[in-house]
């Protein structure tokens, strides 16, 4: 008999036939049978995990922790289900490995081809860093702005906690080393993260005391939006900051995006214990 669902993989799902479920309850459709939101179907003596997601055509690209780009978060979850492996959203937008779009006859500097610079000291700049060739020494500049990124704490491969995937990308760029998302939520043993100060240097911020204090202090600087901004935030509260031209949205739980218009599936990526969540 098969010993795990991975032994039963088929192109459309996982199919386990030819066993007696009274002798082996491993393949019963329970809350733990299908990981990564596969739908468990039991027909006769066959158990199949089906990954038939109803993904839409919205173009809101995301970059997965496996280095692949997806049209939107639903396609990423679909792939995670199909592969039965965890794929996290590392950043919004396509992964940085793509060159210019198109076929080579437009304005694109990339023109659909990977434009290879002549070998220079700039070749050492990696992980999203841009090179300042005018500097006397080799300077790798990280022009990554995480100020507009939603709060979604993550534990990274360097053992540190970060407020969101953008900050991990920023730290990876700043340190010029590979730092990846390991899991959702803060790291259990280490509660520090790196944040950039106004002068562009990095400082360690300790979150061990109370993460809510940060949110509370930030909220003090916000005022409710003027009436003509009614409907600006679909699932959240509209807030106006004195030092910001445009208002921002504080999203309700389960929503994300500039206007809280997108369902935030990422909050369900890592499931504690044997409980299986169903996406709605």
């Amino acid at each position: 008999f098969p010993t795990s669902l991975s032994d039963c993989q088929t192109p459309t799902g996982w199919n386990c036939s030819g066993y007696d479920d009274r002798e082996n309850d491993l393949f019963l459709c329970d809350t733990n049978t299908c990981k990564f939101d596969g739908e468990c179907l039991r027909i006769g003596d066959t158990v199949t995990c089906v990954c038939q997601f109803k993904c839409n055509n919205d173009y809101v690209p995301v970059c997965g922790s496996n280095g692949e780009s997806y049209q939107n978060e639903c396609y990423l979850r679909q792939a995670a289900c199909k592969q039965q492996s965890e794929i996290l959203v590392v950043s919004e937008g396509s992964c940085a490995t793509d060159a210019g779009s198109g076929s080579g006859d437009g304005v694109h500097e990339g023109s659909g081809e990977t434009s290879q610079k002549e070998t220079s000291t700039c070749d050492i700049c990696q992980f999203g860093a841009e090179c300042d060739e005018d500097a006397e020494d080799v300077w790798c500049v990280c022009n990554i702005d995480c100020s507009q990124t939603n709060f979604n704490p993550l534990c990274a491969s360097d053992g540190k906690s970060y407020d969101n995937a953008c900050q991990i990308k920023e730290a990876s760029c700043q340190k010029q080393e590979k730092i990846e998302v390991m899991s959702l939520g803060r790291c259990q043993d280490n509660t520090t993260t790196t944040t950039k100060s106004e002068d562009g240097h990095y400082a360690r911020t300790d979150y061990a005391e109370n993460a809510n204090k940060l949110e509370e202090s930030a909220r003090e600087h916000h005022i409710p939006c003027p009436e003509h901004y009614n409907g600006f935030c679909m699932h959240g509260k509209c807030e106006h900051s004195i030092n910001m031209q445009e208002p921002s949205c504080r999203c309700d739980a389960g929503y994300t995006g500039q206007h809280c218009e997108k369902k935030d599936y990422s909050v369900l990526y890592v499931v504690p214990g044997p409980v299986r969540f169903q996406y709605v």
């Epitope: 919205d58 049209q71 793509d98």
Partner: antibody, heavy 112, light 108 residues
């Protein structure tokens, strides 16, 4: 390197059927939907619909329901557009698109 | 269905100039608007999506702005390769893509 390469120009008579192919490369085919767009001579773009490359489920715009069919050959990363019972007004260039990348277009001429 | 209205329909400019093309949506589409360039007989090229995010490889002389119903594409210091047709496109929230009527940018 991402490319969408479409089949060559077609000259058809009214009432015939045409099948246009779009071969994708340089990315994981099932990670992005495939859209089809029509551009009549000297005109703008008209979205025809899209196909979920993972499930194979097509969605058609109202003006393209009936004679038009999207299909896939996922194993070789190819999307197809088939137009049945061709009419003169089907004369146009048809593009496949994953939004950020477009095919080079297939020109279809329908004439008796 | 959402309607996208682009203006002007045609525009004449010289190399080095700055031009702005606008696009109006019939209802709030937040920031989900893209801009494409198309040259005669060629396929479209994505320039901007999410109203202001530059696509990979697009020169910084292109910039997008706006949200809600009003959007614009600005091209500074026009280059010879910038002449062609430009289209705006709504890309989120409904199953359809909706395109503007296009703006033809020609050399003065």
């Amino acid at each position: 390197q991402i490319h969408l390469v479409q089949s060559g120009p077609e000259l058809k008579k009214p009432g015939e059927t045409v099948k246009i192919s779009c071969k994708a490369s340089g990315y994981t085919f099932t990670n992005f939907a495939m859209n089809w767009v029509k551009q009549a001579p000297g005109k703008g773009f008209k979205w025809m619909g899209w196909i979920n490359t993972y499930t194979g489920e097509p969605t058609y715009a109202d003006d393209f329901k009936g004679r038009f069919a999207f299909s896939l050959e996922t194993s070789v990363s190819i999307a197809y557009l088939q137009i049945n019972s061709l009419k003169n007004e089907d004369t146009a260039t048809y593009f496949c698109s994953k939004f950020d990348y477009w095919g080079q277009g297939t020109t279809l001429t329908v004439s008796s | 269905d959402i309607q996208m209205t682009q203006s002007p329909a045609s525009l004449y400019a010289s190399v080095g100039e700055t031009v702005t093309i606008t696009c109006r949506a019939s209802e709030n589409i937040y920031s989900y608007l893209a801009w494409f360039q198309q040259k005669q007989g060629k396929s479209p090229h994505l320039l901007v999506y999410n109203a202001k995010t530059l696509a990979a490889g697009v020169p910084s002389r292109f910039s997008g702005s706006g949200s809600g119903t009003q959007f614009s594409l600005k091209i500074t210091s026009l280059q010879p390769e910038d002449f062609g047709s430009y289209y705006c496109q709504h890309h989120y929230g409904t199953p359809t893509w909706t395109f503007g009527g296009g703006t033809k940018l020609e050399i003065k």
